[in-house]
Interface confidence: low
């Protein structure tokens, strides 16, 4: 009985610019098939507990599953299938009419080149001078990968980093994001976003650490020279970063065009799709190049901002130049100017 738990099961994620997220396709005896989200008695709009697909993510050499549900846009290949029985079982599947099939999407965490520890070291009274210094980003519960409060550990001592807004630390932040295998520095996070606010029910090991550090050398090139130990402060900010490698990324689609490679740009916030509103920070094709790539089209041919004559037109707004830099989308409740993008078509 073939299921995605079987060792010889083959799957791939397509229609995205990452091998770790996209439309789920499976290899059965007669070739590759797109899996419809209506499989296993589910509704085409239903979101599943993503942990059920952890074996698929593992097999693709990706991290933990983040979402499992309807994919952004259904691109119907020659063959799409609806499967029956237990979730993840492929022993009883039938070919589906393409126009009836909504594809199933899976997003796994991008793999890390080296895995920094995700748990804090247990408190210990014995110093461990031989343990190399290391960093950790602590996200709020349900938060993002590569975003959160920075904790620094040297031997058995660990704690947050005291940070003053006037500190000129761009080089340091890039170094820290890089050291965490999280790309480059994007921005500082407010503590509420970074998850400093303590949940009263939080387990003991997530209480504030006893040590605090201060930035000693913002141009440091090895961790042991970056920080010095200070007495814990009751007030003041702690260093919290958003790095470019954050996950999950904003997903986009093009709707209302004559092909999959043109249309009005929409983005997904959770399970909801909404128009992406024009923003002065995106007056370059870098944003649209990314959108075109996500649709697996060629480069940008053109884009145009559609006039928002209607004061009630609503949508989502990304304050950064590229969508991949947007870890949050803001709602715009009036005068949302939509953007119509034309990418080079794979089938002109």
């Amino acid at each position: 009985r073939l299921s995605w738990y079987d060792p010889d099961f083959q799957a791939r994620l397509t229609r995205s610019n990452s091998k770790c997220q996209g439309q789920l396709e499976v290899y059965l005896k007669d070739g590759w098939h797109m899996v419809c989200s209506q499989s296993w008695g589910r509704s085409s709009k239903q979101w599943e507990d993503p942990s059920q697909a952890s074996k698929v993510c593992q097999r693709l050499n990706c991290g933990v599953p983040l979402s499992l549900g309807p994919f952004l846009v259904t691109y119907t290949p020659q063959s799409s299938i609806i499967c029956y029985g237990q979730l993840g079982s492929f022993s009883n599947c039938s070919h589906s009419r393409n126009d009836m099939c909504h594809s199933l999407g899976l997003t796994c965490l991008e793999p890390q080149k080296t895995t920094p520890p995700t748990t804090r070291p247990p408190p210990t009274t014995t110093p461990e001078p031989t343990a190399p210094p290391r960093l950790q980003l602590v996200a709020q519960s349900g938060g993002q990968h590569c975003a959160g409060v920075v904790e620094f550990y040297s031997g058995s001592l660990g704690g947050t980093i005291s940070y003053e807004a006037q500190d000129k630390t761009q080089d340091l932040e890039n170094f820290l994001c890089n050291n965490l295998q999280c790309g480059s520095f994007l921005k500082h996070l407010p503590e509420t976003e970074a998850g400093r606010a303590q949940d009263p029910g939080e387990p003991r090991e997530h209480q504030p650490l006893p040590i605090q550090w201060k930035i000693q050398n913002s141009s440091c090139t090895s961790l042991e020279h970056c920080f010095r130990k200070i007495k814990p402060q009751k007030s003041g900010r702690v260093l919290a970063l958003l790095c470019s490698g954050f996950q999950p990324k904003v997903q986009s689609r093009l709707v209302g065009g004559s092909s999959i490679c043109e249309g009005t740009v929409e983005v997904r916030q959770g399970a909801q799709w909404a128009a992406l509103c024009d923003s002065s920070s995106a007056r370059s094709s870098l944003r649209w190049e990314e959108v075109c790539r996500e649709q697996q089209c060629g480069s940008v041919n053109s884009y145009r901002v559609l006039d928002a004559g209607d004061p009630t037109s609503r949508g989502l707004f990304c304050p950064h130049q590229k969508l991949s830099q947007c870890h949050e989308l803001w709602e715009r409740n009036s005068y949302c100017k939509k953007v119509f993008v034309t990418c080079q078509d794979p089938n002109p």
Epitope: S284, G298, N301, S302, Y303, Q344, N347
Partner: antibody
Framework: QVQLVQSGAEVKKPGASVKVSCKGS????????IHWVRQAPGQTLEWMGL????????SYNQKFQGRVTMTVDKSTSTAYMELSSLRSEDTAVYYC????????????WGQGTLVTVSS | EIVLTQSPGTLSLSPGERATLSCRTN???????LHWYQQKPGQSPRLLIY???NLASGVPTRFSGSGSGTDYTLTISRLEPEDFAVYFC?????????FGGGTKVEIK
Amino acid sequence: QVQLVQSGAEVKKPGASVKVSCKGSGYTFTNFAIHWVRQAPGQTLEWMGLISTSSGDVSYNQKFQGRVTMTVDKSTSTAYMELSSLRSEDTAVYYCARHYGANNYFDYWGQGTLVTVSS
Amino acid sequence: EIVLTQSPGTLSLSPGERATLSCRTNSSVSSSYLHWYQQKPGQSPRLLIYGTSNLASGVPTRFSGSGSGTDYTLTISRLEPEDFAVYFCQQYSGYPLTFGGGTKVEIK
């Protein structure tokens, strides 16, 4: 037939700028993006960036960000690439190439422009 | 960035012989975005094969391409005198777009 014709060879001093042109003919110029690729003597090819000929939007290789500027003049079907703050290692043949299809390949290339940077 | 490593650097063969050129990538690329170009001295590169195995217009059928993931191959079944040149692989699976270091096919 499709042709990309580039401007002639240039000799520049370190610190100067150079502007290379690439005129497209034999096809609808605004339907295909133009890439710029360079090749130092005896070396491999290095992608510098692309420009959408219909909108003028650009995507640059980070390595050249801040030094390269790509522009397009639709009225003359010409793309331009300007590289500033030249150094000796910028000595290379600079090619423009036409972007084709979703497979993202270059189906036609200009003849190349040799830029020599020397004091 | 995605690094493309071509081997061998130089291939010395006689006309009529078979040439096999390798292009390896440091991370998996989509076969749709792996292409091969030929360049002769003093000339611009010329598209040979696109999407791993599709012959570009006007390219003789003695050229063929194959591969997937991180391993790609260009094969010339019987070398003709005009085939002696440098061959580059190129990927556009990720930004920045990158080329391999090239393989020179020379007359033995």
